[in-house]
């Protein structure tokens, strides 16, 4: 019989990581903190009017490698950074929007205006 308080070694299980969440808080978050078996992230992207919006939260382990790789998306300026080294590590992540490419100004009048307006503000 095992002594009380003594057990066999724990099997490897994901250890919950707490992350700050903003604009991306799941239904189980409390006080803008979410829980994940994966990564914390902070992302910056432009909204429809060209205004930069910062979002932060939790990414599940499944598929997070791909999401954290920050693959460029045509006609969309966004950047994401991920971390796991400590709880709420994404408080210290400050991704910046990728620079405007020349072709962003010659993709048509609406797109041109959209990016030029944003560029003017920075």
């Amino acid at each position: 019989k095992k002594e009380d308080g003594e057990s066999t070694a724990p099997t490897a299980r994901p250890k919950v990581l707490r992350c700050k969440c903003h604009h991306h808080c799941p239904e189980d978050s409390v006080n803008n903190i979410c829980s994940t078996d994966g990564y914390c992230f902070t992302m910056i992207e432009e909204d429809d009017s060209g205004t930069p919006v910062v979002t932060s939260g939790c990414l599940g382990l499944e598929g997070s490698d791909f999401q954290c790789r920050d693959t460029p998306i045509p006609h969309q300026r966004r950047s994401i950074e991920c971390c796991t080294e400590r709880n709420e590590c994404n408080k210290d992540l400050h991704p910046t929007l990728p620079p405007l490419k020349d072709r962003d100004f010659v993709d048509g009048p609406i797109h041109h205006k959209h990016h030029h307006h944003h560029h003017h503000h920075h």
Partner: antibody, heavy 117, light 113 residues
Framework: QVQLQQPGAELVKPGASVKLSCKAS????????MHWVKQRPGQGLEWIGD????????NYNQKFKGKATLTVDTTSSTAYMQLSSLTSEDSAVYYC??????????WGQGTTLTVSS | DIVMTQSPSSLAMSVGQKVTMSCKSS????????????LAWYQQKPGQSPKLLVY???TRESGVPDRFIGSGSGTDFTLTISSVQAEDLADYFC?????????FGAGTKLELK
């Protein structure tokens, strides 16, 4: 094998403070959250809070904020809970327990705290 | 805070009988992101510390006899002991591990006739 060793009993006077210990062995101390749970006779279980030994990040039950302070010493793989301004309401069994995902995989044997003059 | 309500508070059974006990939560414990229910069950024998039986509502902890069966979803959960044994005399607690603060039910005391 996993062991969470706690002293069997502590006797403390009202108004004083006490620091309860929980010495962990048999696993990597920083790989699990350490929780503390209170049990009064016939009153079920109450979660006090938890601490991640890897970065000393803590969460507290609002009810125990100002009453309990959780710390760890990673060199000795020991977790501590300090309870302050003790009253008879703090007399209880206090368990340490470890978790990966907020359910308690392993529990210590508990420390019976008696607050009495 | 999520309130956990267990019933009955106690029950007396004979060896070999089927036992069911209930645990209800004040809000859903089902996470839409992974379709898991964040509920655990513990057994506490007299004079001992609690022992994990089931987590994520229905996943039996390794080494726990298969007569212990966790079921349910959302807000309503059940722990079933398919054929109760003398050594099952204990208090049984449910706990939500959905969010902080973690909360427990008041327990169900299983006594033997």
């Amino acid at each position: 094998q996993v062991q969470l060793q706690q002293p069997g009993a502590e006797l403390v006077k009202p108004g004083a403070s006490v620091k309860l210990s929980c010495k962990a062995s048999g696993y990597t101390f920083t790989s699990y959250w350490m929780h503390w749970v209170k049990q009064r006779p016939g009153q079920g279980l109450e979660w006090i809070g938890d601490i991640d030994p890897s970065d000393r990040y803590t969460n507290y039950n609002q009810k125990f904020k100002g009453k309990a302070t959780l710390t760890v010493d990673t060199t000795s793989s020991t977790a501590y809970m300090q309870l302050s301004s003790l009253t008879s309401e703090d007399s209880a069994v206090y368990y340490c327990a470890i978790s990966g995902w907020d359910y308690f995989d392993y529990w210590g044997q508990g420390t019976t705290l008696t607050v009495s003059s | 805070d999520i309130v956990m309500t267990q019933s009955p508070s106690s029950l007396a059974m004979s060896v070999g009988q089927k036992v069911t006990m209930s645990c209800k939560s004040s809000q859903s414990l089902l996470k839409s992101s992974n379709q898991k229910n964040y509920l655990a069950w513990y057994q506490q024998k007299p004079g001992q510390s609690p022992k994990l039986l089931v987590y994520f509502a229905s996943t039996r902890e390794s080494g726990v006899p298969d007569r212990f069966i966790g079921s349910g979803s959302g807000t309503d959960f059940t722990l079933t002991i398919s054929s109760v044994q003398a050594e099952d005399l204990a208090d049984y607690f449910c706990q939500q591990h959905y969010n902080i603060p973690l909360t427990f039910g008041a327990g169900t005391k299983l006594e033997l006739k």
